[in-house]
Amino acid sequence: MMTGTIETTGNISAEKGGSIILQCHLSSTTAQVTQVNWEQQDQLLAICNADLGWHISPSFKDRVAPGPGLGLTLQSLTVNDTGEYFCIYHTYPDGTYTGRIFLEVLESSVAEHGARFQIP
């Protein structure tokens, strides 16, 4: 029986050009984590396999860094990075657990300020 739960950072926001850490944590189970997949929509970003280590998808190699831990760091953020991200925990003997994170990439605070408080 699957007793574990995935805790995530939930809904997060970050500034364009900055970086963000995507983090999930599996709790309430003694199951062994053997692989974690990170995805955006249906694009595979990275896989961390207990035996094989990290694999970063070639299309994200310049902007994705493994870690910390089983998490993933996204760098040089653009507004196109806004959307849902998924961590898929492969465990033994429980099976698969999934967590969801929604990332919103915002224009820089300076740009936001200028837009909201225009001088008449």
């Epitope: 997949n37 995805e39 249906d42 595979l44 694999h55 849902e84 998924f86 492969h90």
Partner: antibody, heavy 118, light 107 residues
Framework: QVQLQESGPGLVKPSQTLSLTCTVS?????????WNWIRQPPGKGLEWMGY???????RYNPSLKSRVTISRDTSKNQFSLKLSSVTAADTAVYYC???????????WGQGTLVTVSS | DIQMTQSPSSLSASVGDRVTITCKAS??????VAWYQQKPGKAPKLLIY???YRDTGVPSRFSGSGSGTDFTFTISSLQPEDFATYYC?????????FGQGTRLEIK
Amino acid sequence: QVQLQESGPGLVKPSQTLSLTCTVSGYSITDDYAWNWIRQPPGKGLEWMGYISYSGITRYNPSLKSRVTISRDTSKNQFSLKLSSVTAADTAVYYCARKYYGGWFPQWGQGTLVTVSS
Amino acid sequence: DIQMTQSPSSLSASVGDRVTITCKASQDVFTAVAWYQQKPGKAPKLLIYSASYRDTGVPSRFSGSGSGTDFTFTISSLQPEDFATYYCQQSYSTPWTFGQGTRLEIK
């Protein structure tokens, strides 16, 4: 338990539009996952056609993109496939399937055969 | 698109035999491969995902291994109900693609 059931005409004339519907029971298609169409010509392999996600995002196989449209009717918990300008090469068993996040398909409908013939 | 090449395309075996099917990806897909079983007139059934993980309820005689471009699917001891067609699928990037299938027949 999630169940998927395809329905639609079994015979379509060349150059017409093929229309199929998948009715999902036991799970709301707006709750999670991506809802796919996959086809299999008689005696051949499987071809992924596209999906509509729980949030309404669609993604199509580029080999079919100009001809395929996937939509949904959330009130009926259904999603649909339209394939335009069909030819005999589109004769196939059409399956609807639920995709798990990792890109694999743990649940399928039983499939429906569509023949393209005049 | 990533091409998945299965071999052999068909094979004959007897109950109790150990059977191995291979699948080669046209590019590195790390561990993003699934395996399905399909019986005549039925939909495919997921057996293995992420190269080596059995889906819920799948008997332990079915196993998968491999990473990168080379993958193997094994049935350790064939049962009468295992005679079917088997497909590999890459789940690395869209469009998701399948192998051409391996038909497993009774010898």
